[in-house]
């Protein structure tokens, strides 16, 4: 898909900036602007990504216990929290025609959940109550996505500060389930 990933303490997803989706065609001028197809930019280019970590989508791994009322999972589950900036503040030379980079403001990309995975967990309850099985939905990967009005607000937790914040609140595309099951899925204990 044109996404490189490499591991540090967290996984950093660095988008191939040339592959950012363009705004809808009706928002574009009809001019062809891909300099890469027309001989490209002179060698010195200010938009090369010098510090790639400044604009990256990080997958931070968090371990937590799933709870449902007084019950708690026997083992902790590991899931991802999406964090980081998606830019582009500097564009790679081969991305020139892909966006209206000369504009002072442009498409806003956010580091948000891309894929989810289901995991079955066993909940242990106090007082000799029988263990319960619960299926929880966990973030499996993150991706830089352009904001649209259809994005669920829980995906778009404000990244006004650089600190990674665990995502709380309703997950996107929820299936019908009991309130208790929702609680089990969403109660964070980082």
């Amino acid at each position: 898909q044109g996404w490189q990933a490499f591991k540090n303490d967290a996984t950093e997803i660095i988008p191939e900036l040339g592959e950012y989706p363009e705004p809808p065609p009706e928002l574009e001028n009809n001019k062809t602007m891909n300099r890469a197809e027309n001989g490209g930019r002179p060698p010195h280019h200010p938009f090369e990504t010098k510090d790639v970590s400044e604009y990256s989508c990080r997958e931070l791994h968090f371990t937590r216990y799933v709870t449902d009322g007084p019950c708690r999972s026997a083992k902790p589950v590991t899931e991802l929290v999406c964090s980081g900036q998606c830019g582009p503040a500097r564009l790679l030379p081969n991305a020139i025609g892909r966006g209206k980079w000369w504009r002072p403001s442009g498409p806003d990309f956010r580091c948000i959940p891309d894929r989810y995975r289901a995991q079955r967990v066993q909940l242990l309850c106090p007082g000799g109550e029988a263990p319960r099985a619960r299926k929880v939905r966990l973030v499996a990967s993150c991706k830089c996505k352009r904001l649209t009005r259809f994005h669920n607000q829980s995906e778009l937790k404000d990244f006004g500060t650089e600190a990674a914040r665990p995502q709380k609140g309703r997950k996107p595309r929820p299936r019908a389930r009991s309130a208790k099951a929702n609680q089990a899925e969403l109660e964070n204990a980082y």
Partner: antibody
Framework: EVQLVESGGGLVQPGRSLRLSCAAS????????LHWVRQAPGKGLEWVSG????????DYADSVKGRFTISRDNAKNSLYLQMNSLRVEDTALYYC????????????WGQGTTVTVSS | QSVLTQPPSASGTPGQRVTISCSGS????????VNWYQQLPGTAPKLLIY???QRPSGVPDRFSGSKSGTSASLAISGLQSEDEADYYC????????????FGGGTKLTVL
């Protein structure tokens, strides 16, 4: 030192033309996208036009489209704004501004040149 | 009438935290990055925040930006007398042919 210096402002009658210039120094000129932003007396900022490194990369505000033309001469480190069919509402302080970071705001500004359109 | 809506004025005392809001729509703030500018009396504007929450070098970390949905805000903590200025939000607007739009500006007074 990064510097943008505007010139060409003055008093002009409605319907007439004026050409503003912006001379750049202290940085690699063609690394920058350049823009004109104006500010009417006592009012807020209004973006007028912007240009990338060539003529295919140009945007205009609807209020000036068809009347104003932005251009640049990289050999002369200069930005221009040709203003035709001037209106009273075009009266403002015109700033030249630039950005060398895609979608990164206007991080270099000149001090402005005043255009007064009056009969 | 500006496309982006800001309160005309705001005030605070030295040391206080002040927040300036900027409201837009999905064609501007909702889908594009937000910038903030500071204009001290009698001077040209200065870039304060780009890409919603990034500070250019030289801008104190007392200034911070954030964005949620179709609104953005600029927070100034530890207010100082030299922060008295006009503050403008701006974003690209995708409607019609598209243009860079500014808020009407907020005059910040340090009491």
């Amino acid at each position: 030192e990064v510097q943008l210096v505007e010139s060409g402002g003055g008093l002009v009658q409605p319907g007439r033309s004026l050409r503003l210039s912006c001379a750049a120094s202290g940085f690699t000129f063609d690394d920058y996208a350049l823009h004109w932003v104006r500010q009417a007396p006592g009012k807020g900022l209004e973006w007028v036009s912007g240009i990338g490194w060539d003529e295919d990369m140009i945007d205009y505000a609807d209020s000036v489209k068809g009347r104003f033309t932005i251009s640049r001469d990289n050999a002369k480190n200069s930005l221009y704004l040709q203003m035709n069919s001037l209106r009273v509402e075009d009266t403002a302080l015109y700033y030249c501004a630039g950005n060398n970071r895609g979608y990164g705001g206007l991080d270099v500004w000149g001090q402005g040149t005043t255009v007064t359109v009056s009969s | 009438q500006s496309v982006l809506t800001q309160p005309p004025s705001a005030s605070g005392t030295p040391g206080q935290r002040v927040t300036i809001s900027c409201s837009g729509s999905w064609s501007n703030i909702g889908s594009n990055t937000v910038n903030w500018y500071q204009q001290l009396p009698g001077t040209a504007p200065k870039l304060l925040i780009y890409n919603n929450n990034q500070r250019p070098s030289g801008v104190p970390d007392r200034f911070s930006g954030s964005k949620s949905g179709t609104s953005a805000s600029l927070a100034i903590s530890g207010l100082q007398s030299e922060d008295e200025a006009d503050y403008y939000c701006a974003a690209w607007d995708d409607s019609l042919s598209g243009e860079y739009v500014f808020g009407g500006g907020t005059k910040l007074t340090v009491l």
